[in-house]
């Protein structure tokens, strides 16, 4: 016999669920243990059955879920998923804001990332604040010089991608750079994404040479400066 | 070629229903907002609704909230617009446009592309 | 929402000449990350709208030069230095700032 456990907890790191109105959610609480474990939902520490919810919802047991579709403000609370079996019990608590704001293009922190100076070998971070109603996607995109040019025949930047991410919104999303050399100097922009538009800001990342060892003992592996 | 074609209009009562498709190629659809605009005969342009490029989000003008679902399938490359309790004055050309894309915009991010659109009449 | 006031309704013009579209938005569509999201769209008879002028000021691939767009956060101008007859059609702006996305009500131009 076993105790109740999540199978993926991984897929439960998403706490605050924050939805625009008019969207479907879906809580998971996918969960093992012997005897198989039962599943109930509560909201605001009540039995959740949706029995006053227009449209009702769905659970699916079988699944470890609950959906609710066409959301509204009066959904807005704390789900709880209740596991049990004979041996014990697990809960695990979702907050769920239903947003009627009007949905912009997001909304990058004035001065993120920042201009950034570096010794080769140090490590940097070069830090992206990101608002935004609907849940952003972000990436990090470094400009490159491709035949020796940094521009296309169109007039647009040669970038690579370096890293892209699906974040909360308002997040800090970095960007790490290790062990940098004189290579990773250059252009770097934070580009966030919803459905409404783009929005992007560039910062600058000057790598210096390696100083004297006995000056670098004493300095901060990286200097910023805007 | 870019290309968005607009299919499902057609002639419906109100309170009936209808449901509009968007076959899209020439772009990777999966990596695209997509947005249904509607132009009434004679005027001007109204935009419906918004849907993210993994459809995880959904927005809708006031006036269809409700009454319309936006959805889409990435492996199909196809746009959707479910229309229920149809009105007299949901009459009008629906236009899928391109939205906004995942990376670095090489031009607009969105709104370059529209459909040549599909026409919806409600009438009794 | 934001309310997008174009001016004139309509316009003839004789082919040669210039002519100018004005566009106001109730709020400024200066973003922060500089860019002032208004668009120019040009629909001809018949068929959907195409995109003119992006961010403000940016043509559209394919676009003729004589199309330019200006102004700054709340006031908007589309201009035609030398309008030919293949221009006519109804001009729209559109703000692309924030949902709900809302378009001006349309500017007719015609040949004199």
């Known amino acids: 016999q076993q105790a109740p456990y999540w199978t993926h907890p991984q897929r439960m790191e998403k706490k605050l669920h924050a939805v625009p109105a008019g969207n479907t959610v879906k809580f998971r609480c996918p969960a093992a243990g012997n005897p198989t474990p039962t599943i109930r939902w509560l909201k605001d520490g009540q039995a959740f059955h949706g029995e006053n919810r227009i449209g009702g919802i769905r659970l699916r047991h079988q699944h470890w879920s609950l959906v609710m579709e066409s959301v509204v403000p009066s959904d807005r609370g704390t789900y709880t998923c209740l596991v049990e079996n004979a041996v014990g019990s697990i809960r695990y608590n979702y907050l769920l804001d239903v947003l009627e704001r009007s949905p912009h293009r997001p909304i990058l922190q004035a001065g993120l990332p920042a201009n950034t100076t570096a010794v080769v070998g140090s490590d940097v971070e070069l830090l992206c604040k990101v608002y935004s109603d609907a849940q952003p996607h972000i990436q990090w995109l470094k400009h490159i010089v491709i035949n020796g040019s940094s521009f296309g025949a169109d007039g647009f930047p040669y970038v690579q991608v370096l890293k892209t991410a699906d974040i909360n919104s308002s997040e800090v999303e970095v960007l790490y750079l290790r062990n940098v050399s004189a290579e990773d100097a250059g252009e770097y922009t934070c580009l966030a994404g919803n459905s409404i538009g783009l929005s992007y800001q560039s910062a600058w990342l000057t790598v210096l040479p390696e100083e004297d060892p006995t000056w670098t003992a004493a300095a901060p592996e990286a200097r910023y400066t805007d | 070629e870019v290309q968005l074609l607009e299919s499902g209009g057609g002639v419906v009562q109100p309170g009936r229903s209808l449901r509009l498709s968007c076959a899209a190629s020439?772009?990777?659809?999966?990596?695209?907002?997509m947005h249904w605009v509607r132009q009434a005969p004679g005027k001007g342009l109204e935009w419906v609704a918004v849907?993210?490029?993994?459809?995880?989000?959904?927005y809708y003008a006031d006036s269809v909230k409700g009454r319309f679902t936006i959805s889409r399938d990435n492996s199909k490359n196809t746009l959707s617009l479910q229309m229920n309790s149809l009105r007299v004055e949901d009459t009008a050309i629906y236009y899928c446009?391109?939205?906004?894309?995942?990376?670095?915009?090489?031009?607009?991010?969105?709104?370059?592309?529209w459909g040549q659109g599909t026409m919806v009449t409600v009438s009794s | 929402d934001i309310v997008m006031t174009q001016t004139p309704l309509s316009l003839s013009v004789t082919p040669g000449q210039p002519a100018s579209i004005s566009c106001k938005s109730s709020?400024?569509?200066?973003?922060?990350?500089?860019?002032?999201?208004v668009y120019w769209y040009v629909q001809k008879s018949g068929q959907p709208p195409q995109l003119l002028i992006y961010?403000?000021?940016n043509r559209f691939s394919g676009v003729p030069d004589r199309f330019s767009g200006s102004g700054s956060r709340t006031d908007f101008t589309l201009k035609i230095s030398r309008v030919e007859a293949e221009d006519v059609g109804v001009y729209y702006c559109?703000?692309?700032?924030?949902?709900?996305?809302?378009f001006g009500g349309g500017t007719k131009v015609e040949i004199k």
């Open positions: 446009v391109r939205g906004a894309g995942r990376g670095f915009p090489y031009g607009p991010d969105g709104f370059d592309i």
């Open positions: 020439g772009f990777t659809f999966s990596s695209y907002a």
């Open positions: 849907i993210s490029y993994d459809g995880s989000n959904k």
């Open positions: 709020r400024s569509l200066l973003h922060s990350d500089g860019k002032t999201y």
């Open positions: 961010e403000l000021s």
């Open positions: 559109m703000q692309y700032i924030e949902a709900p996305l809302t």
